[in-house]
Amino acid sequence: HTAAQDNCTCPTNKMTVCSPDGPGGRCQCRALGSGMAVDCSTLTSKCLLLKARMSAPKNARTLVRPSEHALVDNDGLYDPDCDPEGRFKARQCNQTSVCWCVNSVGVRRTDKGDLSLRCDELVRTHHILIDLRHRPTAGAFNHSDLDAELRRLFRERYRLHPKFVAAVHYEQPTIQIELRQNTSQKAAGDVDIGDAAYYFERDIKGESLFQGRGGLDLRVRGEPLQVERTLIYYLDEIPPKFSMKRLTA
């Protein structure tokens, strides 16, 4: 009888089924929806999380201007195809044979087409801009305190290496967090910025993915930081390919 058998859950992903039938009675966890093995010592990939979510019962300006190539996830939820390592497959299709290409965070980056659509490679999202608006407070937060607290959050809660948090901008009431991670910078074992951003997004919405942890309680010098709006922009290493019709719509 081992400690694993007493508490066979996945600390980093509550959307799992776990059983103490691994070697030596160790806890082995698989993602809902896909049945894929999950490493509970780190964040689960966004693709597996989305798949699990779809399988669950339905329930002087310092601010950055997103580039013209920045993508926003306007398509909402879908049931994605994930590769054997849990990453998004470059081409996604729905039940009616409508297909499109996605980037590494699963956001559509082409017009929709049919089954003949080709997506040659999974294009990496190397820059993520998280744009937040906080609820009114007595005064503005101290920028350096806010910066330190958000960096600590990404380091400790999401296990994202500090070098990938490029900047924290603040112009009350808007906060912007810039995450940057090129293919060449991401070493084996590094948390992906797309996964960290997704966990953060779910935390901000009060839908924490962590097992048994309380919701996100963000405080800056004891003052609660309550977010009332979130927008996330995704920039890919190769610009997206949309028709002019969409761009002028």
Epitope: T2, N7, R26, Q28, A37, P84
Partner: nanobody
Framework: QVQLQESGGGLVQPGGSLRLSCAAS????????MSWVRQAPGKGLEWVSY????????YYPDTVKGRFTISRDNSKNTLYLQMNSLRAEDTAVYRC??????????????WGQGTMVTVSS
């Protein structure tokens, strides 16, 4: 990138033996824990043996204990599974996998394509 290539599968009679091999590349094999897993038709993956990086620790589920033996040759970047006293219920695709074992959890993160083992008279 990580590559795992299995060989040695085939058709064998009940009570017979087979030795599977797995050639590994694209990662430091000698510092990686490894496992053999199998997938019977219409079933999920189940692990059938585990070996730590230096080969000093092995684990087996009760279903194969005493019949299967996992071993490795780090100088050849190769993992082995010796299967004796085979039964019809051992019929499955066998895949080698890179594994990770902590005090509380076990996970596989890369798998080979697999080699088919059929036990039938």
């Amino acid at each position: 990138q990580v590559q795992l290539q299995e060989s040695g599968g085939g058709l064998v009679q009940p009570g017979g033996s087979l030795r599977l091999s797995c050639a590994a590349s694209g990662f430091p094999f000698s510092s990686a824990d490894m496992s053999w897993v199998r997938q019977a038709p219409g079933k999920g993956l189940e692990w059938v043996s585990y070996i730590n990086a230096d080969g000093s620790k092995t684990y087996y589920p009760d279903t194969v204990k005493g019949r299967f033996t996992i071993s490795r040759d780090n100088s050849k970047n190769t993992l082995y599974l010796q299967m004796n006293s085979l039964r019809a219920e051992d019929t499955a695709v066998y895949r080698c996998a890179r594994a990770k074992l902590t005090d509380t959890h076990y996970v596989e993160d890369y798998w080979g394509q697999g080699t088919m083992v059929t036990v039938s008279s």
